[in-house]
């Protein structure tokens, strides 16, 4: 399989609502029309799949209905958003891009984005 460069930010801080967004950019060597994007989480040397979507160029990026990910594509860039994150979800989130069509098949794996999630402090009781 042929290798392809994938770039993503080194660090992202999730919002207080547990939402993190980052851009995954790939150096497409040609005009791919079927692209698969997968987000993987690496923590304690364990790798798990967070979400994945296949899209045809020019169409919307669609994840499964119960996915915690949403995204949009523009050229060779994919804007990914992960929702519902909690402090325990802090970890390295790796973007993997596969160019499925036309041949040849290309695979690119980013270095990962370290997402930090801080659970919001509960509101203190007011004595008014």
């Amino acid at each position: 399989c042929k290798a392809m460069h994938v770039a993503q930010p080194a660090v992202v801080l999730a919002s207080s609502r547990g939402i993190a967004s980052f851009v995954c950019e790939y150096a497409s060597p040609g005009k791919a029309t079927e692209v698969r994007v997968t987000v993987l989480r690496q923590a304690d040397s364990q790798v798990t799949e967070v979400c994945a979507a296949t899209y045809m160029m020019g169409n919307e990026l669609t994840f499964l209905d119960d996915s915690i990910c949403t995204g949009t594509s523009s050229g060779n860039q994919v804007n990914l958003t992960i929702q519902g994150l909690r402090a325990m979800d802090t970890g390295l989130y790796i973007c993997k891009v596969e160019l499925m069509y036309p041949p040849p098949y290309y695979l690119g794996i980013g270095n990962g984005t370290q997402i930090y999630v801080i659970d919001p402090e509960p509101c203190p009781d007011s004595d008014f």
Epitope: C1, T33, E34, R36, L40, V47, T48, E49, T54, M56, I94, K96, E98, M100, Y101, P102, P103, Y105, L107, I109
Partner: nanobody
Framework: EVQLVESGGGLVQPGGSLRLSCAAS????????AGWYRRQPGKERELVAT???????HYVDSVKGRFTISRDNAKNTVYLQMTTLKPDDTAAYYC?????????????WGKGTQVTVSS
């Protein structure tokens, strides 16, 4: 280790048809780019046809309109329907699956099946 096993080759007369099958020992074909390649006597191995997970198909010019690649994910099998066969189609045909699982790329090959077109 996933294994790909081709079948369906044989001796056929010019103008005849054959259907090659490629069965995978694991359920990787649904996520892979599956393809058929061939090696003709004295030549390099060449791509014949591929099918993507989204069922987009690609054919080398010399087989367009004569060969059809398809897949059955439930059976973990990829097919190559070959019609109007010519002596030039004589070759060993190999099945291939390219893709990745988590951070690991895979590129599996079968051992091949021989197709001979001769009268």
């Amino acid at each position: 280790e996933v294994q790909l096993v081709e079948s369906g080759g044989g001796l056929v007369q010019p103008g005849g048809s054959l259907r090659l099958s490629c069965a995978a020992s694991g359920s990787i074909l649904s996520i892979a780019v599956a393809g058929w390649y061939r090696r003709q006597p004295g030549k390099e191995r060449e791509l014949v046809a591929t099918i993507s997970p989204g069922n987009n198909t690609h054919y080398v010019d010399s087989v367009k309109g004569r060969f059809t690649i398809s897949r059955d994910n439930a059976k973990n099998t990829v097919y190559l329907q070959m019609t109007t066969l010519k002596p030039d189609d004589t070759a060993a045909y190999y099945c291939n699956a390219k893709g990745s699982i988590l951070l690991n790329a895979f590129d599996y090959w079968g051992k091949g099946t021989q197709v001979t077109v001769s009268s």
